[in-house]
């Protein structure tokens, strides 16, 4: 059933989520900046075809439009999306020594955000009985593919977070 911004999500949860989204956006931007500065990989739109061939997936948020928001479905899609990005970021491991610490922090911040969402789902009795299982992740055959994959994953994640932020801000409005 559609639920608008007056739904029963605690304000403290929503504010925590907004904080976390902005933290991850900062991490993601730092990763993008380093990929651009170090490897001149600055334009994700130029790598879209490579992204298709590598099989880098997108995470949907179709249950989250503000006009017909389905709370359980939206939280579930948020969590599943974050779970997907944990796997994608894991696939980027070893991308380069310069990017390692930034990627490490991004990975943990995404995991912590997924935890916050799940915690709230549990409190509302909405958490699924089982965690989603990780689907097949892209295999990068070369250093270039891994770096290009990094650009695309960071770009996809930023788009996902922008939508997430809009949804959460909408829900946080009194």
């Amino acid at each position: 059933t559609p639920l608008g911004p007056a739904s029963s999500l605690p304000q403290s949860f929503l504010l925590k989520c907004l904080e976390q989204v902005r933290k991850i956006q900062g991490d993601g931007a730092a990763l993008q900046e380093k990929l651009c500065a170090t490897y001149k990989l600055c334009h994700p739109e130029e790598l879209v075809l490579l992204g298709h061939s590598l099989g880098i997936p997108w995470a949907p948020l179709s249950s989250c439009p503000s006009q017909a928001l389905q709370l359980a479905g939206c939280l579930s899609q948020l969590h599943s999306g974050l779970f997907l990005y944990q796997g994608l970021l894991q696939a980027l491991e070893g991308i380069s020594p310069e990017l390692g610490p930034t990627l490490d922090t991004l990975q943990l911040d995404v995991a912590d955000f997924a935890t916050t969402i799940w915690q709230q789902m549990e409190e509302l009795g909405m958490a699924p009985a089982l965690q989603p299982t990780q689907g097949a992740m892209p295999a990068f055959a070369s250093a270039f593919q891994r770096r290009a994959g990094g650009v695309l994953v960071a770009s996809h994640l930023q788009s996902f977070l922008e939508v997430s932020y809009r949804v959460l801000r909408h829900l946080a409005q009194p």
């Epitope: 925590k16 900062g26 944990q86 894991q90 997924a114 799940w118 549990e122 965690q131």
Partner: antibody, heavy 119, light 112 residues
Framework: QVHLVQSGAEVKKPGASVKVSCKAS????????MHWIKQAPGQGLEWIGY????????NYNQKFRDKATLTADKSTSTAYMELSSLRSEDTAVYYC????????????WGQGTLVTVSS | DIVMTQSPLSLPVTPGEPASISCRSS???????????LYWYLQKPGQSPQLLIY???NLASGVPDRFSGSGSGTDFTLKISRVEAEDVGVYYC?????????FGQGTKLEIK
Amino acid sequence: QVHLVQSGAEVKKPGASVKVSCKASGYTFPIYTMHWIKQAPGQGLEWIGYINPSIGYANYNQKFRDKATLTADKSTSTAYMELSSLRSEDTAVYYCARGGYGDSLFAYWGQGTLVTVSS
Amino acid sequence: DIVMTQSPLSLPVTPGEPASISCRSSKSLLHSNGITYLYWYLQKPGQSPQLLIYQMSNLASGVPDRFSGSGSGTDFTLKISRVEAEDVGVYYCAQNLELPYTFGQGTKLEIK
């Protein structure tokens, strides 16, 4: 309520390995990261790394990358830390602590496991 | 890695008197989201550490309000308005802005 119960004290010879366990209860184990922290005798706290049980991903402090291996068993809600090629400087109390964000980060700790390395 | 430096390392205090511990980070812990990723932990004798303050100034659940945290991006202070005997132990500041998480060396608070 949340409990983290660690395995008992260990005495090991130099060059040996040791595996410390941290059994979690009172929450959905795979959802939270589990971190490990070292405290050498009379010293401060050092972050070793963490395991994300939901995807089996472990991340390490560079300093401990060749020393510690973190794993987790979702079926028993237990996190493990294996320390290899033990030396006297590995003698310490090792803590597991539950991860999270904000007021959740390290809000719960195990009781600590003393690992003594002595010939 | 971000280096956390505490002072003093030892702090003798008379019960009922205030106490103050300083912590400095080698990099600003203030994120662009407005949050300062600085934590304080207390390790009482023979115990595991416990969370006191999160995100620089927020009191953790069950922590008495005689504790308070403040600071800027790189300089932080933990204050105890009136020290009690149960407050003895080692206080650690820590950052969780980025990995690896790092702790200060600790400040040992003891009763005079």
